[in-house]
């Protein structure tokens, strides 16, 4: 038969950060190849990554069409060297992925502090708005465009001479905080989607940036 000795894929896993979305699976192929299909709950199956010997498939182009939809993927196993024939009626072994809703499940990428500027006893800290592959009217959208006010940033800031971290929060990409004159401060930010009730509600922390280094500016 056309699928002799092919093994169904298993451990199908979605890996997604800032909507860049890859489906991974096992096993590493021995004498077999894979094709992936993806669909929304109500849509038609679309094939991707045809007859690949990889164990991953980038499905970003499909899921960014509507990040609030729920997607399902499946991975078909074929013998190595398989060529599609119109006469083949036997369905190859396949495995379904878990359902995946990008808006709810994509991980938040590590944010970056774009700049900070001190004016007297105030510091304005700006978080870089990351671009995604989500499009609207042929324009790529930023993370803020996609999530709107659902996305907040927590700023941790502390005097270089102390260990206690103060916090501030914003649902824009800017913070304006009070600082003590003549003190140097360090900053780190974290992206958060408070409405999520799952482990992926927070990003990892940004790299720490400290006053007196190149990203900052000071004005009296």
């Amino acid at each position: 038969s056309g699928t002799t000795n092919t093994v169904a894929a298993y451990n199908l896993t979605w890996k997604s950060t800032n909507f860049k979305t890859i489906l991974e699976w096992e096993p590493k192929p021995i004498n077999q190849v894979y094709t992936v299909q993806i669909s929304t709950k109500s849509g038609d199956w679309k094939s991707k990554c045809f007859y690949t010997a990889d164990t991953e498939c980038d499905l970003t182009d499909e899921i960014v069409k509507d990040v609030k939809q729920t997607y399902l993927a499946r991975v078909f196993s074929y013998p190595a060297g398989h060529v599609e024939s119109t006469g083949s009626t036997e369905e190859p072994p396949y495995e379904n992925s878990p359902e995946f809703t990008p808006y709810l499940e994509t991980n938040l990428g590590q944010p970056t502090i774009q700049s900070f500027e001190q004016v007297g006893t105030k510091v304005n800290v700006t978080v870089q708005d990351e671009w995604t592959l989500v499009r609207r009217n042929d324009t790529f959208l930023s993370l803020r465009d996609v999530f709107g006010k659902d996305l907040i940033y927590t700023l941790y800031y502390w005097k270089s001479s102390s260990s206690g971290k103060k916090t501030a929060k914003t649902n824009t990409n800017e913070f304006l905080i009070d600082v003590d004159k003549g003190e140097n401060y360090c900053f780190s930010v974290q992206a958060v989607i408070p409405s999520r009730r799952t482990a992926n509600r927070k990003s990892t922390d940004s790299p720490v940036e400290c006053m007196g280094h190149e990203k900052g500016e000071s004005r009296e």
Epitope: I152, Y156, G164, K166, K169, S188, Q190, R196, K202
Partner: antibody, heavy 120, light 107 residues
């Protein structure tokens, strides 16, 4: 169901130490911030400090700085308040509370509290 | 640190009364104010967040409002289960600070 359960309170002599635990269930503490708040008998609420278990960042109120230390063990889903050099004025019910980390950051869930009495 | 000055410290009211409690922040806290209810021997419970948003499961007779640095908790028609102590809290900056509390007693 989200739950916070404090334990470890009791009677301790001035200068002594105590470690309080705050065991969380129904959510993962690394996704939130955990605060400790205390209430002396017949008095109001006083914030003690916080920890972000995802990075270990903490801040302690001036009244306890240098004496109290907040920590967390994400594998146990538990936060801790280590209290050293205890004074009579530390006598209070100690609560842990979850901060949902939204812009307004209300404390949306609280534990039932554990009583710490500092007396000789 | 930001001070939250709450008034009155106590009040007596009857079932059905409209009750108003106020908190004044010593500096701008935007809308980062929450209100809690506490009954004797129990932990505080969240009522209002972001100055005016009713927390899930809280009866609609509770409401919150903001005018500059003044924040108000209103109970439109006091019920027997509402006799308790109420606290405001700012979480605009670290450290978060609480008001002194308002004890609502039966007249």
């Amino acid at each position: 169901e989200v739950q916070l359960v404090e334990s470890g309170g009791g009677l301790v002599q001035p200068g002594g130490s105590l470690r309080l635990s705050c065991a969380a269930s129904g959510f993962t503490i690394s996704g939130y911030i955990i605060h400790w708040v205390r209430q002396a008998p017949g008095k109001g609420l006083e914030w003690v400090g916080y920890i972000d278990p995802s990075n270990g960042y903490t801040y302690h109120a001036d009244s306890v700085k240098g004496r109290f230390t907040i920590s967390a063990d994400t594998s146990k889903n538990t936060a801790y308040l280590q209290m050293n050099s205890l004074r009579a004025e530390d006598t209070a019910v100690y609560y842990c509370a979850r901060d949902d980390q939204s812009v307004s950051s209300p404390f949306d869930y609280w534990g039932q509290g554990t009583l710490v009495t500092v007396s000789s | 640190d930001i001070q939250m000055t709450q008034s009155p410290s106590s009040l007596s009211a009857s079932v059905g009364d409209r009750v108003t409690i106020t908190c004044r922040a010593s500096q701008d806290v935007n809308t980062a104010v929450a209100w809690y209810q506490q009954k004797p021997g129990k932990a505080p419970k969240l009522l209002i967040y972001s100055a005016s948003f009713l927390y899930s499961g809280v009866p609609s007779r509770f409401s919150g409002s903001r005018s500059g640095t003044d924040f108000t908790l209103t109970i439109s028609s006091l019920q027997p289960e509402d006799f308790a102590t109420y606290y405001c809290q700012q979480h605009y900056t670290t450290p978060p600070t609480f008001g002194q509390g308002t004890k609502v007693e039966i007249k």
